[in-house]
C-alpha cells in the first residue's frame, strides 16, 4: 500500500513538475525590465526563450520572435536545449511511469518489469528536473552578469548632453516557475526510485523448509516468506513479495527429498 502511494504520489508530483517545465519554457517572462531605480518608462519590456515582448502603457502588447538561430547567444541556445531535453525526458518518463503504476494492470506484466520501469521513469524525472534547474540557473546567471554590466555603464554618454538609457533586465516569473517545476520533477523522480525498491522482488528466494513438530506442523520460510502455523499437510504459506505476484495458493509446490528434516 505504501509502495503504491509513493509511486502514485511520485507520478503526480512529476506530472505537475513537467507541466511546469513546459509552461516555463513557453513563457515570455524569463527576464523582465528592471523598474527599480530606473527612469519611469511608458513601456515594459520582457523576454522569453523564443520571443521578446513590449507592453505599452495603453496595454498594447507586441511580441517579436527570434527568427534567427545563428545570431542568438550561445547561452540562450544552451538554455533552450536544456529545457527541451528536460521536457522530452520528462514526457518519456511520464509515458513509462503510466505503465509502471502498480494500480494499473497491463496483461500479465511481472512486478519485476514494473519495478524496472518505475526505476527508469524515476531516473528520467530526476534528469529532467536537473535539466530544467540547470537551464533556469544558467539563464539567471546570464541575467545577473548582464545586470551588473549594464549597471556599471547605466548611462552611456553619446556626446554632450545626449544620453541613452540602457534597459536592465531582472528575473522574470518563468525563472521561478522553472525552478519550482524542476524541483518537483526531481522530487517526483526520487519518489519513483524509492517506490521501485518496494516493488522489486527479493534477490534470493530460498526453498521453503518445513519443521515438523509431533503434534502440528510449523512451516518456516526465510527470505521474504511469512511464517505460518497450521495442522497437517494442508498448511498454505503466502509470500510477501514475488516477482510474478503469485501466492502459493496458485502455485502448488510438491515435497522433495530436501523438504523434511
Amino acid at each position: 500500500m505504501a509502495v503504491t502511494a509513493c509511486q502514485g504520489l511520485g507520478f503526480v508530483v512529476s506530472l505537475i513538475g513537467i507541466a511546469g517545465i513546459i509552461a516555463a519554457t513557453c513563457m515570455d517572462q524569463w527576464s523582465t525590465q528592471d523598474l527599480y531605480n530606473n527612469p519611469v518608462t511608458a513601456v515594459f519590456n520582457y523576454q522569453g526563450l523564443w520571443r521578446s515582448c513590449v507592453r505599452e502603457s495603453s496595454g498594447f502588447t507586441e511580441c517579436r520572435g527570434y527568427f534567427t538561430l545563428l545570431g542568438l547567444p550561445a547561452m540562450l541556445q544552451a538554455v533552450r536545449a536544456l529545457m527541451i531535453v528536460g521536457i522530452v525526458l520528462g514526457a518519456i518518463g511520464l509515458l513509462v511511469s503510466i505503465f509502471a503504476l502498480k494500480c494499473i494492470r497491463i496483461g500479465s506484466m511481472e512486478d519485476s518489469a514494473k519495478a524496472n520501469m518505475t526505476l527508469t521513469s524515476g531516473i528520467m524525472f530526476i534528469v529532467s528536473g536537473l535539466c530544467a534547474i540547470a537551464g533556469v540557473s544558467v539563464f539567471a546567471n546570464m541575467l545577473v552578469t548582464n545586470f551588473w554590466m549594464s549597471t556599471a555603464n547605466m548611462y552611456t554618454g553619446m556626446g554632450g548632453m545626449v544620453q541613452t538609457v540602457q534597459t536592465r533586465y531582472t528575473f522574470g516569473a518563468a525563472l521561478f516557475v522553472g525552478w519550482v517545476a524542476g524541483g518537483l520533477t526531481l522530487i517526483g523522480g526520487v519518489m519513483m526510485c524509492i517506490a521501485c525498491r518496494g516493488l522489486a522482488p527479493e534477490e534470493t528466494n530460498y526453498k521453503a523448509v518445513s519443521y515438523h513438530a509431533s503434534g502440528h506442523s510449523v512451516a518456516y520460510k526465510p527470505g521474504g516468506f511469512k511464517a505460518s502455523t497450521g495442522f497437517g499437510s494442508n498448511t498454505k504459506n503466502k509470500k510477501i513479495y514475488d516477482g510474478g505476484a503469485r501466492t502459493e495458493d496458485e502455485v502448488q509446490s510438491y515435497p522433495s527429498k530436501h523438504d523434511y528434516v
Epitope: 527612469p39 519611469v40 511608458a42 513601456v43 519590456n45 505599452e56 502603457s57 498594447f60 545626449v162
Partner: antibody, heavy 120, light 113 residues
Framework: EVQLVESGGGLVQPGGSLRLSCAAS????????MHWVRQAPGKGLEWVSY????????YYVDKLKGRFTISRDNAKNSLYLQMNSLRAEDTAVYYC?????????????WGQGTLVTVSS | DIVMTQSPDSLAVSLGERATINCKSS????????????LAWYQQKPGQPPKLLIY???TRESGVPDRFSGSGSGTDFTLTISSLQAEDVAVYFC?????????FGGGTKVEIK
C-alpha cells in the same frame, strides 16, 4: 465617433481649487488610458498627468505632484482632474486626451479643452 | 526629464515647397525591447486642439495625408511636409512617448511665404 468634452474650467483665485471633468463617448472608455495636457496662452503644450484604464498606475509631472489629482469613473465614462492650491502659472487651456492603442503611446484623440484662469 | 528641442521656431515656406522640422531629444527614444522609436508629431491649428500626425517616429496616423512623413531614430527626428498646402499652416509639436513625464518640444510655427 470618438468624442472628449472637457468641463469645469473658469476663473478661480490663487490658492483656490477646481475640478475638471472630461466626458468620453464613442469608444470603450474603460479600455483606454487617459491624459491631461495643458497649454498656457500663446505657449507650448505641457503634459500634466496620465491614468491607466484600471486607475493604476498613475503618473504626474513632478512639479504638479501633490497639488493635482487625476481620477476616473469608468461607469460614468468620465475623467477628472482635481486641482488644489492653484497659482497664476496654472492658467491654461486644459485638454483631456486618449492614450491611443497600438500608436506607440501617442495621444490619438483630444478634447476641445477648457480654460482655467487663476487670477485675483 | 527628457528635454525635447525643436528647430526652427518658425518656418516660412512657399506653397508646394518642402518644409522640414527637426526635433532632438536629450535621451534616446529608441526602445531596445522592440527597436521602435517612441516619438510622435502633432499639428495644432489656431483655436483647435492638437491632432496626431505621426507616431513611432515614422508611422502616419490614419487619415493623415501622405505628404506628411516622419523619419529619424534615437535622438534625432524630422517631420517633412513634401508639398506645403494652405491648410498645413499650423504649429507642429514633437513629443517623447517613451519616458514619463511625457514631454513636448517647444513647437515650430509653419507659415506660407
Amino acid at each position: 465617433e470618438v468624442q472628449l468634452v472637457e468641463s469645469g474650467g473658469g476663473l478661480v483665485q490663487p490658492g483656490g481649487s477646481l475640478r475638471l471633468s472630461c466626458a468620453a463617448s464613442g469608444f470603450t472608455f474603460s479600455s483606454f488610458g487617459m491624459h491631461w495636457v495643458r497649454q498656457a496662452p500663446g505657449k507650448g503644450l505641457e503634459w500634466v498627468s496620465y491614468i491607466s484604464s484600471g486607475s493604476s498606475p498613475i503618473y504626474y509631472v513632478d512639479k504638479l505632484k501633490g497639488r493635482f489629482t487625476i481620477s476616473r469613473d469608468n461607469a460614468k465614462n468620465s475623467l477628472y482632474l482635481q486641482m488644489n492650491s492653484l497659482r497664476a502659472e496654472d492658467t491654461a487651456v486644459y485638454y483631456c486626451a486618449r492614450a491611443g492603442y497600438a500608436v506607440r503611446n501617442a495621444l490619438d484623440y483630444w478634447g476641445q479643452g477648457t480654460l482655467v484662469t487663476v487670477s485675483s | 526629464d527628457i528635454v525635447m528641442t525643436q528647430s526652427p521656431d518658425s518656418l516660412a515656406v512657399s506653397l508646394g515647397e518642402r518644409a522640414t522640422i527637426n526635433c532632438k531629444s536629450s535621451q534616446s527614444l529608441l526602445n531596445v525591447g522592440n527597436q521602435k522609436n517612441y516619438l510622435a508629431w502633432y499639428q495644432q491649428k489656431p483655436g483647435q486642439p492638437p491632432k496626431l500626425l505621426i507616431y513611432g517616429a515614422s508611422t502616419r496616423e490614419s487619415g493623415v495625408p501622405d505628404r506628411f512623413s516622419g523619419s529619424g531614430s534615437g535622438t534625432d527626428f524630422t517631420l517633412t511636409i513634401s508639398s506645403l498646402q494652405a491648410e498645413d499652416v499650423a504649429v507642429y509639436f514633437c513629443q517623447n512617448d517613451l519616458f514619463y513625464p511625457l514631454t513636448f518640444g517647444g513647437g515650430t510655427k509653419v507659415e506660407i511665404k
